[in-house]
């Protein structure tokens, strides 16, 4: 994360959504990797 971005109030107010989005994209990446791995 960009540390300077955290001074923006928006970052604080969206933190939960940002974390949710991060978790979701990590989950999607893991699933994608699993599909690739399974196809090998």
């Amino acid at each position: 994360d960009n540390p300077s971005l955290s001074i923006d109030l928006t970052f604080h107010l969206l933190r939960t959504l940002l974390e949710l989005a991060r978790t979701q994209s990590q989950r999607e990446r893991a699933e994608q990797n699993r599909i690739i791995f399974d196809s090998v």
Partner: antibody, heavy 118, light 112 residues
């Protein structure tokens, strides 16, 4: 000083798309989220969405989801808002805005009038 | 969505006299961090909105001290102690505590 300069007025036909730009200066573009707000004649201000210019995370107001696309070009310190499937009710002034550590909309662009008319 | 209701819709004022605008939220806008993200904006004719007050009662830099904000929970007020000609325009309250962020319908301050 912080400046947000938006692109000029647009006239579009129903069903078309419009892309409005917002060039930021006077601060490090990637340090602050950029928001988009619109003001239709006689209507209240409406928050449309917000982008994290650093990592590209975008959050939309559900009301506009599917029709609005917010992007950014960090090398040009510019944010963009594209609205598709335009209808007459989309006739409005569109603003970009930036917050601070204390408030959400501390600095505003000059606004871009988008007129949707057949 | 949190509905922000302002009153009055129109506020005829006499220059030099006080003015007061009310803003009510449809639900509490106290954020989970215990702060209340209630802001007030002024929009002069033909101009972009301008931030006046943040977090209920804090004046933004450069805002004259004749402007003050108060309130809590669901009930908020913007006061102008002595209205000046440059204060004419539309005033909006805004809540940033809940997504989607929402604005009030506006109060037009005009000469009586």
């Amino acid at each position: 000083q912080v400046q947000l300069v938006q692109s000029g007025a647009e006239v579009k036909k129903p069903g078309a798309s419009v892309k409005v730009s917002c060039k930021a200066s006077g601060y490090t573009f990637t340090d602050y989220f950029m928001k988009w707000v619109r003001q239709a004649p006689g209507q209240r201000l409406e928050w449309m969405g917000v982008i994290n210019p650093n990592q590209g995370d975008i959050f939309y107001n559900q009301k506009f989801k599917g029709r609005v696309t917010i992007t950014r070009d960090t090398s040009a310190s510019t944010a963009y808002m594209e609205l598709s499937s335009l209808r007459s009710e989309d006739t409005a002034v569109y603003y970009c805005a930036r917050g601070t550590d204390r408030a959400l909309f501390a600095y505003w662009g000059q606004g871009t009038l988008v007129t949707v008319s057949s | 969505d949190v509905v922000m209701t302002q009153s009055p819709l129109s506020l005829p004022v006499t220059l030099g006299q006080p003015a007061s605008i009310s803003c009510r939220s449809g639900q509490s806008i106290v954020h989970s961090d215990a702060n209340t993200y209630l802001e007030w904006y002024q929009q002069r004719p033909g101009q972009s909105p301008r931030l006046l007050i943040y977090k209920v009662s804090n004046r933004f830099s450069g805002v004259p001290d004749r402007f003050s904000g108060s309130g809590s929970g669901t009930d908020f007020t913007l006061k102008i102690s002595r209205v000046e000609a440059e204060d004419l325009g539309v005033y909006y309250c805004f809540q940033g505590s809940h997504i989607p962020w929402t604005f009030g319908g506006g109060t037009k301050v005009e000469i009586k």
